[in-house]
């Protein structure tokens, strides 16, 4: 019955406005930090679910969460919270995180399906490609971890956890 959330108009989403009014819209109502899957709704004055606004045309407040949500729906991909990007498992099989285990293990059983560079790796060829030197190592963070996107940058576990900051 409800068309809300399905037939939206264009223009800035209402929830984007907190970027310009981070303190909220009511006098005396302080903006709180919200769980990663929620955003601060300045009109209601409470943390609200990002899931229900992911289909809004121009929401940015929940951008990282919404990207991860849509990424998880794609087979053979996972959302890298550190890089804030949707990563194809096919491109990192062999040095893959656990999110890609199912995909990569199936692929490795049938080498005909592997991309050429991985077929060469399996047959003993070593590709000396500078693009692979920073190959993604997975998000098995324990304490301090080097960021694959920013070589040399050390991130604490707490910093890694701050993946949905807006």
């Amino acid at each position: 019955m409800s068309g809300l959330g399905r037939s939206r108009r264009g223009g800035r989403s209402r929830v984007d406005q907190e970027e310009r009014f981070p303190q909220g819209l009511w006098t005396g109502v302080a903006m709180r930090s919200c769980p990663e899957e929620q955003y601060w709704d300045p009109l209601l004055g409470t943390c609200m679910s990002c899931k229900t606004i992911c289909n809004h045309q121009s929401q940015r407040t929940c951008a990282a969460f919404c990207r991860s949500l849509s990424c998880r729906k794609e087979q053979g991909k996972f959302y890298d919270h550190l890089l804030r990007d949707c990563i194809s498992c096919a491109s990192i099989c062999g040095q893959h995180p656990k999110q890609c285990a199912y995909f990569c293990e199936n692929k490795l059983r049938s080498p005909v399906n592997l991309p050429p560079e991985l077929r060469r790796q399996r047959s003993g060829e070593v590709e000396n490609n500078s693009d692979n030197s920073g190959r993604y190592q997975g998000l098995e963070h324990r304490g301090s971890e080097a960021s694959p996107a920013l070589p040399g940058l050390k991130l604490s576990a707490d910093q890694v956890a701050l993946v949905y900051s807006t």
Partner: antibody, heavy 120, light 111 residues
Framework: EVQLQQSGPELVKPGASVRMSCKAS????????MHWVKQKPGQGLEWIGY????????KYTEKFKGKATLTSDKSSSTAYMELSSLTSEDSAVYYC?????????????WGQGTSVTVSS | DIVLTQSPASLAVSLGQSVTISCRAS??????????MQWYQQKPGQAPKLLIY???NVESGVPARFSGSGSGTDFSLNIHPVEEDDIAMYFC?????????FGGGTKLEIK
């Protein structure tokens, strides 16, 4: 299909309290706030407040602070409203309604209402 | 609190005619280009039903004869053509500021 099923009519004595329920189905209960609205016989609609089931945040209109208490139970997807120190002024139909958020803010689904009659 | 004043309080129209119900807010309900004004229909013995949200967006499943317009503080609900099924109370409601508030209602009757 989204549905809000409210508890049955109540006949209560002045000074007593009453607790009514609103069971939600057909959507993720914690993703939307639940509003409560009062309607006296033959009169208009009066917003009482809302509860956010994900964190139990509540907001009330000034008039209902101390009169209404909103709670929710995530495990049963049920919102509750308790009205205390009842008088004849509290005789009304009380509706729960789901509130949308994000681009637009509206009450898109309503319960059928719970009738409360305060009489000695 | 934002006060919403609806007019007229009641009106009687002939089937097939047009009808316009007005709602005036005590202050603007605009928020970054969107009017946070809704319209609801309530038939006797039933719960209210959302007709229009954001001043002019027709809710899914609502007949196209219902339309909403306005911005800032002045809004209107238009029904054209009026059908027998439209006999009801109509309420405007703002969600720009908590507490959300409703207009006093307009009773639509058929001549």
């Amino acid at each position: 299909e989204v549905q809000l099923q409210q508890s049955g009519p109540e006949l209560v004595k002045p000074g007593a309290s009453v607790r009514m329920s609103c069971k939600a189905s057909g959507y993720t209960f914690t993703n939307y706030v639940m509003h409560w609205v009062k309607q006296k016989p033959g009169q208009g609609l009066e917003w009482i407040g809302y509860i956010n089931p994900s964190n139990d945040d509540t907001k009330y209109t000034e008039k209902f602070k101390g009169k209404a208490t909103l709670t929710s139970d995530k495990s049963s997807s049920t919102a509750y409203m308790e009205l205390s120190s009842l008088t004849s002024e509290d005789s009304a139909v009380y509706y729960c309604a789901r509130g949308t958020h994000g681009d637009y803010y509206a009450l898109d689904y309503w319960g059928q209402g719970t009738s409360v009659t305060v009489s000695s | 609190d934002i006060v919403l004043t609806q007019s007229p309080a009641s009106l009687a129209v002939s089937l097939g005619q047009s009808v316009t119900i007005s709602c005036r807010a005590s202050e603007s309900v605009e928020y970054y280009g969107t009017s946070l004004m809704q319209w609801y229909q309530q038939k006797p013995g039933q719960a209210p039903k959302l007709l229009i949200y954001g001043a002019s967006n027709v809710e899914s499943g609502v007949p196209a004869r219902f339309s909403g317009s306005g911005s800032g503080t002045d809004f209107s609900l238009n029904i054209h053509p009026v059908e027998e099924d439209d006999i009801a109370m109509y309420f405007c409601q703002q969600s720009r500021k908590v507490p959300w508030t409703f207009g006093g209602g307009t009773k639509l009757e058929i001549k």
